[in-house]
């Protein structure tokens, strides 16, 4: 089918476009291009007759069009008015015509945009800022970049005016960033220079450092104050309400107990007109105090929360020590100490992290211990366990099921039968059961603190008849002299005897055979190839008995030492050498040959026609079993004598 492809489809003003013709028929009289979606003589651009190679301009010819012998049309110096459809009218030499229509779109090359702003110094949490991308351009898409990333999703960011305007409501200091706008159309993309938003903020509540509030008599007190602020804050210090100095740092050498008191830092921002203060209480001790532990989370959730234990008070030039379970800290990637050892962080706590924890402060003479702290780790519930494990019951007995799931605080339990809620207890008791009590018994454990729930479902069958049992195996393809196999007779049923047969016979006495789990499990230690037999289990009670289908054990073994046949080692020149290698193996091994150490072919049989003395040497057969991962080999020496030199030589096969 005749088709037109525009290359490119989106064309920049001033550039050129090629209307490329595909599947042009052979044997043509000529063709003509028209502007629009139909053949209209008034809108003919150019006609072309194949035979004469004559191009005839039409009414819509602009002088910018070039027609090619393959009917493709090149339009140069594209203008906006060229946008639209173009129709090719092809006349074949038998005067049958075909038409095809193509199209392209024309877009202007975009200028470099710039950003205008309605507020050059907005105040945090008060002002809004509107950025506008200039100039306004038709058919252009506007994009915005913050720190060279696309706009984050935020209710405070709003695009309007066809995305040309970006408004930041209630600006914050985090909006201090590099903003760029970009204009795009299908033929060009231009980015503005960046505009940095200068948000006035603060001061925030000042931070006084260092954080420690306990000092020893005779030390120097050096407090520094900092408050996040733009422009930077001006600072003042007050001690017990009395102004001291207008500096960021307060220094008092050789302090005494009399320097204890409240120390206030005031931060002031002259542009926002705001003041903020922070007070710290400094205690100067003659002796170090008894330490104590504070925790940032008294009820952490297992595998979710981290807990930071801090040894108080903070005292300069002091060594902090920690103990867990009356032992020094174990090495663990989940235990982290701060640089000054004052804070112990337990990452992703587990139920085993309860403690107790103690911290200590070392002074010149002794170590002062804190009282122990125990963590209350919330965990679980784990998957509930329903006991007993029987799944088959006889009618008339009592059904008593108990559910347990490890959980802190202890789990709340619910029982469901076939999806219907029964009771909110840990135990479920049903007396004198019948076949109607068969069904799906679900125990649901819920931890109210963590909000987590876990369920376990157990199928209970009440039947006088025992079901046909089946054998499950922990290893379907054991390797000889290496693996053990445990067969288990399913299902587990109450008041039931379990029996086993091997190849239709009762179990032989062997130290490698062991029954366990009430004879329900048969374990074969160090399996051998002779254990590849049919195993059947049976269950019986006073009412009925049943046997499983046999399970044949597929023991992987070998390869054994191979045998090369025939056994002959001397041959006459001119005979055929036909060596066959065999090794007992499951699965069958892969064979390969080497002659004098040189690899030959990967076949079981090695055949060499008309051997000569040049074929003397060592012939090695290598066998490998990919399943057992074992290899074996054998070497045979072959001697080839010239014909008639020695009696008793094999003539070969």
């Amino acid at each position: 089918k005749l088709t037109i492809e525009s290359t490119p489809f989106n064309v920049a003003e001033g550039k050129e476009v090629l209307l490329l013709v595909h599947n042009l028929p052979q044997h043509l009289f000529g063709y003509s291009w028209y502007k629009g979606e139909r053949v209209d003589g008034n809108r003919q651009i150019i006609g072309y007759v194949i035979g004469t190679q004559q191009a005839t301009p039409g009414p819509a010819y602009s002088g910018r069009e070039i027609i090619y012998p393959n009917a493709s049309l090149l339009i140069q110096n594209i203008i906006q008015n060229d946008t639209g459809f173009y129709t090719l009218h092809v006349i074949k030499s038998d005067l049958v015509n075909e038409e095809a229509t193509g199209q392209f779109r024309v877009y202007p090359e975009l200028p470099k945009p710039s950003i205008s702003s309605n507020n050059s110094k907005p105040v945090e949490d008060k002002d809004a800022v509107a950025f506008t991308c200039e100039p306004e351009t038709q058919d252009a898409t506007y994009l915005w970049w913050v720190n060279n990333q696309s706009l984050p999703v935020s209710p405070r960011l709003q695009l309007s005016n066809g995305n040309r305007t970006l408004t930041l409501f209630n600006v914050t200091r985090n909006d201090t960033a590099s903003y760029k706008c970009e204009t795009q159309n299908p033929v060009s993309a231009r980015r503005s220079d960046s505009v940095i938003l200068n948000v006035l903020y603060g001061p925030d509540a000042p931070t006084i450092s260092p954080l420690n509030t306990s000092y020893r008599s005779g030390e120097n007190l050096n407090l520094s104050c900092h408050a996040a602020s733009n422009p930077p804050a001006q600072y003042s210090w007050f001690v017990n309400g009395t102004f001291q100095q207008s500096t960021q740092e307060l220094f008092i050498p050789n302090i005494t107990v009399n320097n204890s008191g409240s120390y206030t830092c005031q931060a002031h921002n002259s542009d926002t007109g705001l003041n903020r203060t922070t007070v710290t209480t400094i205690t100067v001790y003659a002796e170090p105090p008894k330490p104590f532990i504070t925790s940032n989370n008294s009820n952490p959730v297992e595998d979710e929360d981290a807990v930071a234990l801090t040894c108080e008070p903070e005292i300069q030039n002091t060594t902090y020590l920690w103990w867990v379970n009356n032992q020094s800290l174990p090495v663990s990637p989940r235990l982290q100490l701060s640089n000054d050892n004052r804070t112990l962080t337990l990452l992703s706590v587990t139920r085993n992290d309860v403690g107790p924890y103690e911290c200590g402060i070392q002074n010149e003479l002794s170590v002062d211990h804190s009282d122990p702290v125990i963590l209350n780790v919330l965990y679980g519930p784990d998957d509930p366990t329903i006991s007993p494990s029987y799944t088959y019951y006889r009618p008339g007995v009592n059904l008593s099921l108990s559910c347990h799931a490890a959980s802190n605080p202890p789990a709340q339990y619910s029982w469901l039968i076939d999806g219907n809620i029964q009771q909110h207890t840990q135990e479920l008791f049903i007396s004198n059961i019948t076949e109607k009590n068969s069904g799906l018994y679900t125990c649901q454990a819920n931890n109210s603190a963590s909000g987590h729930s876990r369920t376990t479902v157990k199928t209970i069958t009440v039947s006088a008849e025992l079901p046909k049992p089946s054998i499950s195996s922990n290893n379907s393809k054991p390797v000889e002299d290496k693996d053990a196999v445990a067969f288990t007779c399913e299902p587990e049923a109450q008041n039931t005897t379990y029996l086993w047969w091997v190849n239709g016979q009762s179990l032989p006495v062997s130290p490698r055979l062991q029954l366990s789990n009430g004879n329900r499990t048969l374990t074969l230690f160090n399996v051998t190839r002779n254990d590849a037999r049919a195993y059947v289990c049976g269950i019986q009670n006073s009412v009925s008995a049943n046997r499983s289908d046999p399970v044949t054990l597929d023991v992987l073994y070998g390869p054994d030492t191979p045998i090369i046949s025939p056994p002959d080692s001397s041959y006459l020149s001119g005979a055929n050498l036909n060596l066959s290698c065999h090794s007992a193996s499951n699965p069958s091994p892969q064979y390969s040959w080497r002659i004098n150490g040189i690899p030959q072919q990967h076949t079981q049989v090695l055949f060499i026609a008309k051997i000569t003395p040049n074929n003397n040497g060592t012939y090695a057969c290598f066998v490998s079993n990919l399943a057992t991962g074992r290899n074996n080999s054998i070497v045979k020496s072959i001697t080839v004598s010239a014909s008639g030199t020695s009696p008793g030589l094999s003539a070969g096969a």
């Epitope: 035979g51 004559q54 039409g58 005067l95």
Partner: antibody
Framework: EVQLLESGGGLVQPGGSLRLSCAAS????????MSWVRQAPGKGLEWVSA????????YYADSVKGRFTISRDNSKNTLYLQMNSLRAEDTAVYYC??????????WGQGTLVTVSS | DIQMTQSPSSLSASVGDRVTITCRAS??????LNWYQQKPGKAPKLLIY???SLQSGVPSRFSGSGSGTDFTLTISSLQPEDFATYYC??????????FGQGTKLEIK
């Protein structure tokens, strides 16, 4: 032997209509494109219209476009030219001709159309 | 459109004469030019196609030559039945066929 026989010419008033026919024989009609060419009295030849073998493609000279319609009935081996809104300058002998690529290789004897009040 | 100009527009010659008629195209049309003969009161008849190929049944005294813009029709030995009007024609677009104005060959 290829034969083309035109009919349907005559006297018609300006604005009137006329239908010309061309019966073809001696060749597989549906395999060839056909054309009409006219010759005003004492003047040269002027191509009027053409049609492909199946009838699916038609072509007209600018002077008759919108007024004349070319058609064919391949089952009757006949070519037609329906002429409407006739003018005095349409007066001419109208020939039907068989088209082979780039040439008109066989022509009919022509039929005279006179447009006069 | 390409213009076809025949010369001369009329010509007198005698039986046995060698006659040449010229057709000139306003632009090159390569070798795609055809010649027709029309006798008074008769339909035109194709003589030469593709500038130099003789149509089946046309006497060999007629020949055509030329390529590009200049073409000639030659009658090597004029016969009585050759007195007629001769038209050149080329394939074109949007008019599929463009004819020359004709050359009338008369008896001297």
């Amino acid at each position: 032997e290829v034969q083309l026989l035109e009919s349907g010419g005559g006297l018609v008033q300006p604005g009137g209509s006329l239908r010309l026919s061309c019966a073809a024989s001696g060749f597989t009609f549906s395999s060839y494109a056909m054309s009409w060419v006219r010759q005003a009295p004492g003047k040269g030849l002027e191509w009027v219209s053409a049609i492909s073998g199946s009838g699916g493609s038609t072509y007209y000279a600018d002077s008759v476009k919108g007024r004349f319609t070319i058609s064919r009935d391949n089952s009757k081996n006949t070519l037609y030219l329906q002429m409407n809104s006739l003018r005095a300058e349409d007066t001419a002998v109208y020939y039907c001709a068989r088209y082979s690529p780039y040439v008109l290789d066989y022509w009919g004897q022509g039929t005279l159309v006179t447009v006069s009040s | 459109d390409i213009q076809m100009t025949q010369s001369p527009s009329s010509l007198s010659a005698s039986v046995g004469d060698r006659v040449t008629i010229t057709c000139r195209a306003s632009q090159s049309i390569r070798g795609y030019l055809n010649w027709y003969q029309q006798k008074p009161g008769k339909a035109p008849k194709l003589l030469i196609y593709a500038a130099s190929s003789l149509q089946s049944g046309v006497p060999s005294r007629f020949s055509g030559s030329g390529s590009g813009t200049d073409f000639t029709l030659t009658i090597s030995s004029l016969q009585p039945e050759d007195f007629a009007t001769y038209y050149c024609q080329q394939p074109s677009y949007p008019s599929l066929f463009t004819f020359g104005q004709g050359t009338k060959l008369e008896i001297k």
